[in-house]
């Protein structure tokens, strides 16, 4: 853990948030598509 406390940086946090947002959008799109196809 050479970066110590700096592992939890804001830039890393922003990247994680962007990934979560993207996954939520993709999963939401798939869910809507599934409902539409029923």
């Amino acid at each position: 853990h050479s970066d110590g406390i700096f592992t939890d940086s804001y830039s890393r946090y922003r990247k994680q948030m962007a990934v979560k947002k993207y996954l939520a959008a993709v999963l939401g799109k798939r869910y809507k598509q599934r409902v539409k196809n029923k």
């Epitope: 110590g4 406390i5 700096f6 592992t7 939890d8 804001y10």
Partner: antibody, heavy 113, light 110 residues
Framework: QSVEESGGRLVTPGTPLTLTCTVS????????MNWVRQAPGKGLEWIGI??????TYYASWAKGRFTISKTSSTTVDLKMTSPTTEDTATYFC?????????WGPGTLVTVSS | AQVLTQTPSSVSAAVGGTVTINCQSS????????LSWYQQKVGQPPKFLIY???NLASGVPSRFKGSGSGTQFTLTISDLECDDAATYYC??????????FGGGTEVVVK
Amino acid sequence: QSVEESGGRLVTPGTPLTLTCTVSGFSLSSAAMNWVRQAPGKGLEWIGIFDPYSSTYYASWAKGRFTISKTSSTTVDLKMTSPTTEDTATYFCARGGGEFFIWGPGTLVTVSS
Amino acid sequence: AQVLTQTPSSVSAAVGGTVTINCQSSQSVYKNKYLSWYQQKVGQPPKFLIYQASNLASGVPSRFKGSGSGTQFTLTISDLECDDAATYYCAGGYSGNMVDFGGGTEVVVK
């Protein structure tokens, strides 16, 4: 994603006091949590940090006076071992390593006889 | 131990004007860039403005600009608005997992 402090109250000098920081929306397993204080009308003062690897670091002036510990998957405590009147302040919990990007509203501690 | 010195302690400028706040460290911050800036209004927690010396936090207007590296850093606020009246703090992260705050700068908007 948020943090909130609790436990602040009026105590007499020498009476130990524990403050709690409760996080929501993220995991302490990957978060660095700081305690920062601010005396009335004064500036911000860093007390210490609990890092994602369960290591704790303190400002030189805070060693022996404060203890930071993770008490559950969502809480980090700050124990004031023997408060003096100089410890009267608003105590903030903040997330981030070397930078503070999520802050709680703070909890007021008054040390007075 | 590292020391962060913020100057001036107070600065006044008119709406539409520009203010510059300096932050000098007694030793280099981590990776020469771990210097952040915060805005605090009375009765509120600090607000995160700038990280790693020059990067704007989410939602912060581009009127706020951070610069510098190593031991010398600057926050510049241009096109001042009444809402910018607050106390501004710098914070440095250091090797050895230490953090320190500057003493703060009060910005008065006329």
